[in-house]
């Protein structure tokens, strides 16, 4: 099994590892499937691409019957199977079988924290946000290891790219020192950013 790892939105080339001459195409059926669902077929020279892959998949017949998937999505991750059937006597016989595992990475960048003052009060508001990752993120605010209540946390997903964006607000009393951590967990991964507030100097600085 061949393993291919790519970043989301990148291009992945999955090779069948087999060549068929132009003359042989008329007597050949080629199936690309992903986890038992069809991606692409070429039957005696007629090509068909399934709707989920249309307009973003190229079949490169001259390059080992590879499929090239453009603008990778998280849902493209999985095991692809290429089957080549060759007409022999009175039937199509399996001539070649190959498996390619595609991993699609979609890491959230380190979140950014912005802050602003709420007029005529001792309350300051900070906003933590990041976008462009997968799977669905879970954001929490921590201070000294204790979880805090955010004002509101919004998670949205782009239907086209399948990538998530997350944003969360936290209000705090600016008359005391604070060190807040914005922690984002997604799948088995996590990213975080720390916001420090120092009352004596009336300043903040994020950890990098």
């Amino acid at each position: 099994v061949i393993h291919v790892t790519k970043e989301v939105k990148e291009v992945a080339t999955l090779s069948c590892g087999h060549n068929v001459s132009v003359e042989e195409l008329a007597q050949t059926r080629i199936y690309w499937q992903k986890e038992k669902k069809m991606v692409l077929t070429m039957m005696s020279g007629d090509m068909n691409i399934w709707p989920e892959y249309k307009n973003r998949t190229i079949f490169d017949i001259t390059n080992n019957l590879s499929i090239v998937i453009l603008a990778l999505r998280p849902s493209d991750e999985g095991t692809y199977e290429c089957v080549v059937l060759k007409y022999e006597k009175d039937a199509f016989k399996r001539e070649h079988l190959a498996e390619v595992t595609l991993s699609v990475k979609a890491d959230f960048p380190t979140p950014s924290i912005s802050d602003f003052e709420i007029p005529t009060s001792n309350i300051r508001r900070i906003i933590c946000s990041t976008s462009g990752g997968f799977p669905e993120p879970h954001l929490s605010w921590l201070e000294n290891g204790e979880e805090l209540n955010a004002i509101n946390t919004t998670v949205s997903q782009d239907p086209e790219t399948e990538l998530y964006a997350v944003s969360s607000k936290l209000d705090f009393n600016m008359t005391t020192n604070h060190s807040f951590m914005c922690l984002i967990k997604y799948g088995h991964l996590r990213v975080n950013q720390t916001f420090n507030w120092n009352t004596t100097k009336q300043e903040h600085f994020p950890d990098n």
Partner: antibody
């Protein structure tokens, strides 16, 4: 000589399920994709789907997804078609056929009648 | 999916008459992927013409097939009684595989 022997006629109640068999002679099913085709009374032919018996991969016409399930047992050299939640619309003759450039070999067909 | 439209749906021909059945395909396909089957009542379909113009084993030479792209036809040069049957065209260009609705040919 290639021959596809299908199981006998079935009379089944609405809502039930039925499993039809297709046992070839003259070839080993693991070397060929096996297809199923439906023909309702006085109607045309409808392709249901295929199975690659070697690895169990299947492909269905979307309109039969959830209704039909194609399986194969290479040890007994038999392909199966299971139909679930039967209604009068499923009353038909079901054929198995072997993949080729075209359907060169067909079973004799299994009539399925859905009736209360 | 690719839709195959056969015409006529029903026709009758006298012995010795020339018969043509057409099959119109909703999108262009390779001629090697268009096939014809003959079916008589209460029997399984039989392969009749494959790859547009090749006669299946045992098919009389009075039958012929032609066409390309989206337009295909089956022709009987001289109708005989045993030709009375239903004829179906079928495409193997893309999934789902599809058949025409059939042309019932009767003897006049």
């Amino acid at each position: 000589e290639v021959h596809l022997q299908q199981s006998g006629a079935e009379l089944v109640r609405p809502g039930a399920l039925v499993k039809l068999s297709c046992k070839p002679s003259g070839f080993n099913i693991k070397d060929y994709y096996m297809h199923w085709v439906k023909q309702r009374p006085e109607q045309g032919l409808e392709w249901i789907g295929w199975i690659d018996p070697e690895n169990g991969n299947t492909l269905y016409d979307p309109k039969f997804q959830g209704k039909a399930s194609i399986t194969a047992d290479t040890s007994s050299n038999t392909a199966y078609l299971q139909l679930s939640s039967l209604t009068s619309e499923d009353t038909a003759v079901y054929y198995c056929a072997r993949e080729g450039l075209f359907f060169a070999y067909w079973g004799q067909g299994t009539p399925v009648t859905v009736s209360a | 999916e690719i839709v195959l439209t056969q015409s006529p749906a029903l026709m009758a021909a006298s012995p010795g008459e020339k018969v043509t059945i057409t099959c119109s395909v909703s999108s262009s396909i390779s001629s090697s992927n268009l096939h014809w089957y003959q079916q008589k009542s209460e029997t399984s379909p039989k392969p009749w013409i494959y790859g547009t113009s090749n006669l299946a084993s045992g098919v009389p030479v009075r039958f012929s097939g032609s066409g390309s792209g989206t337009s295909y036809s089956l022709t009987i040069s001289s109708m005989e009684a045993e030709d009375a049957a239903t004829y179906y065209c079928q495409q193997w260009s893309s999934y789902p595989l599809t058949f025409g609705a059939g042309t019932k040919l009767e003897l006049k």
